[in-house]
């Protein structure tokens, strides 16, 4: 399914404290498959991969094609 990389943005929407680490929420949302179609505005966000929207954070993330890495799947994985 390729590499999953999350955009650095976390809106903090489900976090009580703005500086709270949302990693637990993110992990849980990934485990439960809490993703939706990326909004149209992010159609071209992922360069070499597909976009999905992290419901818990209301932010785009990219699932990279094989051989690509980076928040937007913009870099070739030299170790691939």
């Amino acid at each position: 399914d390729g590499n999953s990389t999350r955009s650095p943005e976390t809106n903090g929407l489900l976090c009580g404290d703005p500086e709270e680490n949302c990693a637990a929420t993110t992990t849980q949302s990934k485990r439960k498959g809490h993703f939706s179609r990326c909004p149209k505005q992010y159609k071209h966000y992922c360069i070499k991969g597909r976009c999905r929207f992290v419901v818990a954070e209301q932010t785009p993330s990219c699932v990279c094609d094989e051989g690509y890495i980076g928040a937007r799947c913009e870099r070739v994985d030299l170790f691939y």
């Epitope: 955009s7 943005e9 809106n11 703005p18 500086e19 939706s36 909004p39 209301q58």
Partner: antibody, heavy 116, light 106 residues
Framework: QVQLLESGGGLVQPGGSLRLSCAAS????????ISWVRQAPGKGLEWVSH????????SYADSVKGRFTISRDNSKNTLYLQMNSLRAEDTAVYYC?????????WGQGTLVTVSS | DIQMTQSPSSLSASVGDRVTITCRAS??????LGWYQQKPGKAPKLLIY???SLQSGVPSRFSGSGSGTDFTLTISSLQPEDFATYYC????????FGQGTKVEIK
Amino acid sequence: QVQLLESGGGLVQPGGSLRLSCAASGFTFSRYWISWVRQAPGKGLEWVSHIDSNSDWTSYADSVKGRFTISRDNSKNTLYLQMNSLRAEDTAVYYCARGGSLFDYWGQGTLVTVSS
Amino acid sequence: DIQMTQSPSSLSASVGDRVTITCRASQGIISYLGWYQQKPGKAPKLLIYAASSLQSGVPSRFSGSGSGTDFTLTISSLQPEDFATYYCQQYDALNTFGQGTKVEIK
């Protein structure tokens, strides 16, 4: 606590330029998308632009495309909006807001008046 | 561009009233919708995201519903601090706001 503080507003003539700044504190600025949203006097809200955390993804409203440029300096925890070829209809309070799609924290705004 | 139309533009209500504001998108936006409250001279405050999820710290008397093109913000029992202007915002195709609904004291 999260704080966003805009500055740089003022009176400018049509066709002129202005650069707004937004100083952020109370959160890890470099992890978040940030946006500019404006509000003309007595009017509603209008999204202007957003920028991702790494400065490699930006989008603009059609009304400002080609005239405004959003940028950020993560080392200074600061967001910028360079506004060129200003028009009377750009007169508004300009807010910076945390987020790219939704805006969970806002600054107090800075007033930009474009008039001769 | 997606246009967002709110109704009514203004309404008068009393403390304790149930208030409903509607927002219609010119095309389907799934559930990519937020609601904000703004008081005079202040910045907007996020109330609801993803059409129906309550933002942290927002009182439970606020609720949102809808999907596709038709959305609703409901205040179950209006409180004195709720008199303000409310905006919907879609974030499917870029970001656009409704024109606002002013909730005034009857």
